[in-house]
């Protein structure tokens, strides 16, 4: 059962796993959620009745029954992990904590103009977990405006104390705001010989890389495959770090693979979600339960629905035994990974999908692309919405893209003459416009947020957000698309599609079926040559064939230019403007979404 509210002046008795320090009960709840075993927690707030050494302690707890006895205690705040909830979770914490000193290893000290600059420095430093900044009112003159970057083994402070005129906060790497290089390569036959901070068992290098990414101290990893000569090290995932943040020594070794933490590529890749099945593989761990199941998929479902289950092994039924049902072993361990991995015993193993909600929903697999043809099929572009106006009569106005459960990203120029959000309707999961009848459900629009520098499409800033009145429940036919990550700014996208119900030629009508066209990106330099009378800025991106023939057109505005990279779809552009439609040497011009990620996050995450 999902319980989100916090219990004031309440302490859970027993079940302690570990104690960490957090600046707030809210953040304690996040830490509990991300801990492999924590189901409940008790946080101690600052209080005159409480021993100051216990202030800001966050005690992480577990219980077989998923609850613990409650005791009244002043200044204690208790609650449950979000593991039991189905809503999306994020580790992103932008809060700044005033008059708190978060203790850790101070490894870098420099002068900064503001707390924001200090936080940016922390976000762009590979080792930094959190920071403390002495404001210009700090009593000690030589420490004023000093930005201390800090790290710890756990990623959380080792202690938190009250200190006047300082502020503290966390790195925003988990908010996808780091400018650090995103290094996606996995190197075969390679061992990184730097110091190990931890080791876990993993079925493949991809899982090892994902574990490294969400481990607070891991910067790169080495994985020994099941063919590794030393038997005791097979399937071993070594989590590593170095002072420079980069591997210092690379050794060529067969049957080993190495790679990097993807912390600065966050939101573009699944990090917590290990969705594959591993055949002829047994995961060992503490046994939680053994249940009958028809298939390994059913076993994974059972594991996902059991809040304490972390991974499973399914042994298929022997012929005609137990109504064709096999045995599903639900398992757990102290760190969420198997304690040992065995091969050749006929089991099928995998992980809970409960943690998938900690990844951005947009990274989950969708229907494979239908190659060829111009009409889309249902579920092919589940982020695409049709935006209707009801005034003077109801009609399709523009396209748009779902980027969050209450947010649509579209073009600012769509709202010329739109006086109020009340006349707008957003329809999702639609393939044919003819499906939209009077009784078709839609989302009302609560607010239209147009970029304040927008004047006209051709001069840029052609971007707008719609805040919906109600939240979108994600399904196969309506789900979000990922925003491009700033760490991926230099990716060259080669698989880009424009979609919409717009005209198929300049003088035409809105199409009934959602149309799609694969269109290559064009460099801004090339695009500028085609539009001598306009300034093509870096905040724009162009796409089109030199010979024309395929393009967005009237009615497609606001819709997505969707590009697939590393099996994940990204919203690279918003259909904005162009000269005519599909004309020779006149590419379409799109709003370059990566340049507006900060603006989008600022608007969608504003309290």
């Amino acid at each position: 059962e999902c319980v989100t509210q916090l219990l004031k002046d309440t302490c859970f008795e027993g079940g302690d796993i570990t104690t960490v320090f957090t600046p707030s009960a809210k953040y304690c709840q996040v830490v509990c959620t991300y801990h492999p075993r924590c189901l409940l927690f008790t946080f101690t707030a600052e209080s005159p009745s409480e021993d100051p050494t216990r202030w800001f302690t966050c005690v992480l707890k577990d219980s077989v029954t998923e609850t613990l006895p409650r005791v009244n205690r002043t200044a204690a705040i208790s609650g449950y992990s979000f593991k039991q909830c189905s809503h999306q979770i994020s580790a992103c914490n932008k809060d700044i904590y005033v008059d708190l000193d978060m203790k850790g290893i101070n490894y870098n000290s420099s002068v900064a103009k503001s707390a924001q600059e200090c936080q940016e420095r922390c976000t762009d430093d590979v080792h930094c977990h959190f920071f403390t900044y002495a404001t210009r009112q700090f009593p000690s003159l030589e420490h004023r405006n000093i930005c201390l970057l800090k790290h710890t083994q756990t990623g959380t402070p080792t202690r938190i104390t009250k200190l006047d005129k300082v502020v503290s906060g966390f790195s925003l790497k988990s908010c996808a705001l780091s400018n650090l290089a995103c290094i996606r390569d996995i190197f075969p036959n390679t061992v990184f010989a730097d110091s190990n901070i931890d080791s876990v068992m993993a079925p493949d290098a991809f899982v090892c890389g994902r574990i490294c990414t969400h481990h607070p101290g891991c910067l790169f990893f080495t994985f020994f495959s099941q063919e590794w000569p030393k038997e005791s090290q097979r399937n071993l995932c070594l989590l590593k770090t170095s002072e420079s943040g980069l591997p210092s020594t690379r050794i060529k070794k067969s049957k080993a693979l190495s790679g990097f933490s993807l912390q600065s590529c966050r939101h573009s890749i699944p990090v917590f979600c290990h969705s594959s099945f591993y055949h002829d593989t047994d995961f060992l761990g503490e046994e939680l339960d053994i249940v009958a199941a028809k298939s390994h998929e059913a076993c994974q479902k059972l594991c996902t629905n059991a809040v304490r289950c972390q991974f499973f092994t399914y042994t298929p039924a022997q012929a005609s035994c137990n109504e064709g049902k096999g045995k599903c072993y639900l398992k757990l361990s102290s760190n969420g990974s198997p304690t040992k991995i065995l091969h050749g015993r006929g089991g099928i193993s995998g992980y809970t999908l409960r943690l998938c909600k900690m990844d951005n929903e947009c990274t989950t697999k969708i229907k494979p692309r239908i190659v060829g043809g111009t009409a889309s099929v249902r579920g092919e572009w589940p982020w695409q919405v049709t935006l209707h106006t009801t005034s003077p009569t109801q009609r399709h106005l523009c396209g748009g893209s779902i980027i969050g459960n209450q947010w649509i990203l579209t073009a600012a120029h769509c709202f010329y003459g739109v006086e109020s959000p009340k006349i707008l309707r957003v329809y999702s999961g639609i393939l044919n416009q003819s499906e939209i009848k009077e009784d078709t459900s839609f989302f009302g629009v609560q607010e239209i947020i147009i970029h304040d520098q927008y004047k006209m499409a051709e001069s840029g800033y052609d971007i707008a957000l719609l805040k919906l009145e109600t939240t979108v429940n994600y399904t196969d036919s309506q789900r979000p698309i990922c925003l491009p990550s700033k760490g991926d700014r230099n990716v060259i996208y080669t698989d880009c599609w424009v979609t919409g119900w717009g005209y198929r030629k300049l003088r035409d009508k809105i199409q009934n079926t959602l149309q799609k066209a694969k269109i290559p990106l064009v460099t801004n330099e090339e695009c500028q040559k085609r539009y001598r009378g306009h300034k093509i800025t870096h905040k724009m991106i162009c796409a089109g064939y030199r010979e024309g023939g395929k393009d967005a057109c009237k009615g497609d505005s606001g819709g997505p230019l969707s590009c697939k990279h590393n099996e994940v779809w990204h919203l690279v552009g918003i259909t904005s403007w162009g000269e005519g439609c599909a004309q020779r040497e006149r590419p379409g011009v799109y709003t370059n979404v990566v340049e507006y990620v900060d603006w989008i996050l600022e608007k969608t995450q504003a309290v």
């Epitope: 590979v126 650090l180 290089a181 420079s244 591997p247 230099n490």
Partner: nanobody
Framework: QVQLVESGGGSVQAGGSLRLSCAAS????????VGWFRQAPGKGLEGVSA????????YYADSVKGRFTISQDNSKNTVYLQMNSLRAEDTAVYYC?????????????????WGQGTLVTVSS
């Protein structure tokens, strides 16, 4: 003693090409980030391109994407910047820099070692 030496600068007509080289001694490009930066007259330092030599991951400023290509020759401990379709606004002193940490690739503040620079002049 670390030394980075740039070469290959010069004067060229708009639309022309140049290839800059950066050779290192006392510092190995392998396992490190190497960046090209430029400073136009009266302007600040601007990140142009960078490479992480271990896997060859490359990074480019939007203003040069599609025109400039960064590459490496680990055996010669040299990094190259191939500049095509040059424009007047590419006129600047080009610097090669080496980082010893994981960095935001186009942020000059995080690079440790710097060359003396080579002048590129593009006339229209």
């Amino acid at each position: 003693q670390v030394q980075l030496v740039e070469s290959g600068g010069g004067s060229v007509q708009a639309g022309g090409s140049l290839r800059l080289s950066c050779a290192a001694s006392g510092y190995t490009f392998n396992n490190n980030f190497v960046g090209w930066f430029r400073q136009a007259p009266g302007k600040g330092l601007e990140g142009v391109s960078a490479i992480y030599s271990l896997g060859g991951s490359t990074y480019y400023a939007d203003s040069v994407k599609g025109r400039f290509t960064i590459s490496q020759d680990n055996s010669k401990n040299t990094v190259y910047l191939q500049m095509n379709s040059l424009r007047a606004e590419d006129t600047a002193v080009y610097y090669c820099a080496g980082a010893i940490t994981w960095v935001p690739p186009l942020s000059h503040r995080r690079y440790t070692y710097w060359g003396q620079g080579t002048l590129v002049t593009v006339s229209s």
